[in-house]
């Protein structure tokens, strides 16, 4: 049948299951004259054969674990053996069957973990291999803890990453492990292939012994440091210690201060490096970090608290160059004229900022001195001797000494004598009627203008009008601004209106003066006005408590772990249903009722962090209005990616014969996070048998040189296996292959004597 099993010579790919005895031909190539025969080259392994007439077949069962892809070339030759078509690539992909069981690399593992280690941070890896294809379930391994001994209160202290075999503490383990109570644990770990999902999966088990060690990496007690210290700096104030020697300590200033006056030495001793100023900053919170030689954090940072103790280094300050008060002509003795409030930058509610007030001078001294007194501690000015007369003395100036326990400051007060306040404000109308507004009316909107008048002396506290809402607005949704020139009041919306809590509000305004009324005059009904505010319903969408919710987890958390939660409320009080939108990787699920977010698949920082999805809150019932917020999941790196080659290195060649040993440079990379100094790979040959012919030498953390050890190589392709280790915790290793061809060269390129019908030689790398 032309097409499926036979046809012209062209690049083709065939897939054949391993382990099956040959039952049919693979393909029948048809020759076009002058081609008369076919030749097969490449990775035939004496399994693949082509007959001269073009019949391609295999003669025994394939084994994917020996070779997963056979790269073959088929050429059509004329009667003289000259290539007239091709060679074309024929790829045989060997499909996997589950014919290998997973096996742990060790029957017993031993490890140790410090108490209070970060939950989810791996301290030990178990590793199993399965020769089957990891891209199929046959080779997908699933790790599980079968048993933890001892098991206290049925609580698991340890967890394993199903995918990577990374063992870490659970949150409970981080909090409760204590070497004084229980210094050792044993885990039985199983590994299954088929991703653990099939009854037909193969499995293996291993035993893990874990020692719990004490953690001395603890935050020190808060430190108190007196400001403006004159002692020689730096001064040691506290210390931290990592559990093992050799840690590199550093301090992290989360507040990003313009000057950060602390340092740490390589013993872990923490110093203040310069005098502190409490008035600039009264407390510092920063972090001590311990890192390994590669700059990777060894554990969580410790929070260091420094409180700056106050000294009396600030004098009192006046509120303004001159403070102005008004007093009415006939005001009675003892009446309050106003309060002078001076400030002191020293610590509140201490002797350093406790102030005393004293009048040191009055001008003019008419009709006498001592007309005013000031309360020593409160700073309240009172009329002391008699009523004042505006026509005799319209203005008095006082000099007031304000002192703390060490410093004195002079402040100046001007007191203006004004007419008596014997007229009350009178509203132009007592009822401003009804006003209907939708509950979503904008904040800041002016909804009503009110007006009262006062016949007292203009532009004094006796005639100035202040409007207050004294009834009907306990939530403070409304406010009144006064125009100081016209005494017009503008009623504005200060907070959102809400139909659900206040559909009708009966508002009462009061108009009053800042100055007290004279004895015998009182505010009456003329100084009050009312209006009715009617709020209409607008169905509002649920409201999230935050615009962006953020959570941080290690990328190797177990499936089903809670990674965060969101909250929203519906203004109408309806129930809310939560859902996710834009979970393109299928990593998360949300509890529709509680808003808790869980992982449902293995997370991968290398696929992108933070992982951003939208959370949707929808009213249940009603008009099903919804609103959207962002959930950002920050994934913290674990070392779960083995090194690999940074690019495709097919086409490497040396001209044959070698006149002198040669070398070539290659680059490695991996997808994990490399903070500070980048990767630190080490390189070695992948098998001992290569060492007679090749050597590999490290150039830097990412590049290495592959060199030939001699010149006696055959004219063919060599596949050199290189082992690359990332030195991570735990170290991961990748074995990569560099194909290197030794070939006859023409003008610096590989030559193969053959051509199309014209006979032009094929030249390539």
């Amino acid at each position: 049948q032309e097409g499926k099993f036979s046809g012209p010579l062209k690049p083709m790919t065939f897939s054949i299951y391993e382990g099956q005895e040959p039952s049919q031909i693979i393909f029948q190539f048809k020759a076009n004259p002058p081609a008369v025969t076919f030749e097969l080259t490449g990775e035939t392994d004496n399994i693949f054969v082509i007959e001269r007439e073009g019949l391609l077949y295999y003669n025994r069962a394939l084994d994917r674990e020996t070779r997963s892809t056979h790269n073959l070339q088929v050429a059509a030759l004329d009667a003289n053996g000259i290539i007239v078509e091709g060679p074309v690539p024929i790829t045989i992909k060997v499909k996997d069957i589950n014919d290998n069981r997973p096996t742990f690399l060790q029957s017993k593992y031993e490890g140790s973990v410090r108490q209070n280690s970060r939950p989810g941070k791996p301290f030990l890896y178990v590793n199993a291999t399965d020769l089957d294809d990891p891209a199929t379930p046959n080779g997908q391994l699933y790790y599980q803890i079968v048993i933890q001994l001892p098991m206290i209160n049925n609580v698991m202290y340890f967890q394993i990453n199903n995918k990577t075999g990374a063992i870490s503490l659970t949150r409970e383990g981080s909090q409760e492990l204590n070497p004084a109570k229980n210094p050792s644990y044993n885990l039985v770990i199983s590994v299954k292939d088929m991703g653990g999902q099939s009854e037909n999966s193969f499995s293996d088990t291993t035993s893990v012994d874990i020692i719990v060690t004490e953690n001395i990496w603890k935050a020190p007690k808060p430190v108190e440091m007196v400001e403006n210290s004159t002692d020689p700096h730096p001064i040691k104030i506290t210390q931290v210690r990592w559990n093992d020697p050799g840690a590199q300590y550093s301090l992290v200033d989360k507040e990003k201060l313009p000057r950060f006056p602390f340092s740490i030495d390589q013993e872990g001793d923490i110093y203040v490096t310069q005098p502190l100023d409490r008035e600039e900053k009264d407390a510092y919170v920063f972090y001590a970090v311990a890192k390994d030689e590669y700059g990777k954090p060894l554990s969580y940072p410790l929070e260091i608290h420094v409180k700056v103790k106050d000294i009396n280094d600030n004098p009192p300050t006046c509120p303004s160059p001159v403070t102005v008060f008004e007093v009415q002509e006939n005001e009675r003795l003892g009446n309050s004229i106003g309060t002078l409030t001076a400030h002191d930058r020293d610590e509140e509610n201490t002797a350093n900022s406790f102030l005393n007030y004293r009048i040191v001078e009055q001008t003019p001294k008419l009709p006498m001195d001592g007309l005013f007194l000031i309360q020593t501690y409160a700073g309240m000015l009172q009329l002391a001797k008699q009523s004042l007369k505006k026509q005799d003395t319209p203005q008095y100036n006082l000099t007031i000494e304000v002192s703390d326990k060490d410093f004195k400051t002079l402040c100046f007060v001007q007191i203006n004598v004004i007419d008596i306040n014997d007229q009350i404000p009178i509203f132009e109308k007592s009822d401003y009627g009804n006003l209907t507004l939708a509950e979503d009316t904008n904040i800041g909107s002016t909804i009503l203008t009110i007006q009262a008048t006062d016949a007292d002396e203009p532009f004094t506290g006796s005639s100035k009008i202040l409007y207050h809402i004294i009834k009907g607005d306990s939530e403070g949704r409304l406010g009144v601004d006064t125009d100081p020139h016209t005494n017009t009041g503008y009623v504005i919306i200060k907070k959102p209106l809400d139909f659900e809590t206040a559909a009708v509000s009966n508002i009462v305004f009061k108009a009053e003066n800042p100055e007290p009324l004279v004895f015998g005059v009182k505010y009456n009904a003329s100084s009050f006005a009312k209006f009715t505010l009617i709020v209409t319903d607008v169905n509002e969408a649920p409201q999230f408590s935050q615009h962006v919710f953020q959570a941080k987890v290690s990328e190797d958390v177990a499936i089903g772990t809670k990674v965060g939660n969101v909250t929203a409320k519906d203004p109408e009080g309806l129930d809310i249903s939560y859902s996710l939108r834009g979970d393109t990787r299928g990593w998360l699920k949300i509890d529709h009722v509680t808003g808790e977010i869980f992982s449902v698949a293995p997370l991968d920082r290398e696929a992108g962090s933070p992982y951003r999805v939208q959370v949707v809150a929808t009213e249940v019932g009603g008009s099903s209005l919804s609103s959207v917020s962002e959930f950002h999941l920050i994934l913290m790196d674990v070392n779960d990616n083995p090194p690999r080659l940074a690019k495709d290195y097919t086409g490497l060649f040396f001209c044959h014969p070698l006149s002198a040993p040669g070398s070539l440079i290659f680059e490695a990379t991996d997808d994990d996070q490399h903070l500070f100094r980048g990767p630190h790979f080490t390189f070695s040959l992948g098998s001992g048998s290569l060492q007679n012919d090749w050597e590999v030498s490290k150039i830097n953390g990412t590049h290495a040189r592959l060199s030939t050890r001699h010149t006696e190589f055959e004219e063919r392709e060599y596949v050199v296996l290189i082992r690359i280790n990332d030195g991570g915790r735990p170290p991961l290793e990748g074995i990569v292959s560099l194909p290197v061809t030794f070939c006859s060269c023409v003008e610096g390129s590989c030559f193969r004597p053959a051509g199309h019908q014209t006979g032009i030689p094929t030249v390539g790398m």
Partner: antibody
């Protein structure tokens, strides 16, 4: 022992045709191509073409198309070259040769030659 | 067509000499070149194939070298029985072509 035996000499008149033979022994004719070359006195060799006796496939030098016709008779293990419309320019020694090659070793060459047929075109 | 040029039609030599016979191709032929020896009244005999491989039974004083467009046949320790015509041939591209030949003579 592989041998290629050619007819020794041919004397023909201008305008006529001639068919010279190349009989092989020591191997099977159908296993290799037979090539024909022309050599004039004090001159180099010229490649005329080849025949693959197994299936009669032929390949010619463009210069000799219409002049030479290559055939083979497997039953007598003999290859033939017929030259027509002969002129004095066709007077030369004509060699047949076996093209032996090993694809695996990229080895290609004429490993056995006939002793040559001398063609004289004269009136 | 690819032209194979043997620039020296004749070369004078002495027994024991080292002789270099050159052949230049008009375009790149890789290593698809053979060398043949022809004595008067005889058919050609194969010496070298694939530019540098010595054919079975050929004395090791015959060496071929070169690739691309420039090729050399070297005879070290020249013998009197080596007096003959030497031809190069390319089989990279049809039509196959021969060089004009170089005849070795005694000085």
């Amino acid at each position: 022992e592989v041998q290629l035996q050619q007819s020794v000499a041919e004397l023909v008149k201008p305008g006529a045709s001639v068919k010279m033979s190349c009989k092989v022994s020591g191997y099977t004719l159908t296993d290799h191509t037979i090539h024909w070359m022309k050599q004039r006195p004090e001159q180099g060799l010229e490649w005329i073409g080849y025949i693959y006796p197994r299936d009669g496939i032929t390949g010619y030098n463009e210069k000799f198309k219409g002049k030479a016709t290559l055939t083979a008779d497997t039953s007598s293990s003999t290859a033939y070259m017929q030259l027509n419309s002969l002129t004095s320019e066709d007077s030369a020694v004509y060699f047949c040769a076996r093209w032996g090659y090993s694809y695996r070793n990229y080895a290609y060459y004429y490993d056995y030659w006939g002793q040559g047929t001398t063609l004289t075109v004269s009136s | 067509d690819i032209v194979m040029t043997q620039s020296q039609k004749f070369m004078s030599t002495t027994v024991g000499d080292r002789v270099n016979i050159t052949c230049k191709a008009s375009q790149n032929v890789g290593t698809a070149v053979a060398w043949y020896q022809q004595k008067p009244g005889q058919s050609p005999k194969l010496l070298i194939y694939s530019a540098s491989n010595r054919y079975t039974g050929v004395p090791d004083r015959f060496t071929g070298s070169g690739s691309g467009t420039d090729f050399t046949l070297t005879i070290t320790n020249m013998q009197s029985k080596d007096l003959a015509d030497y031809f190069c041939q390319q089989y990279s591209s049809y039509p196959w072509t021969f060089g004009g030949g170089t005849k070795l003579e005694i000085k």
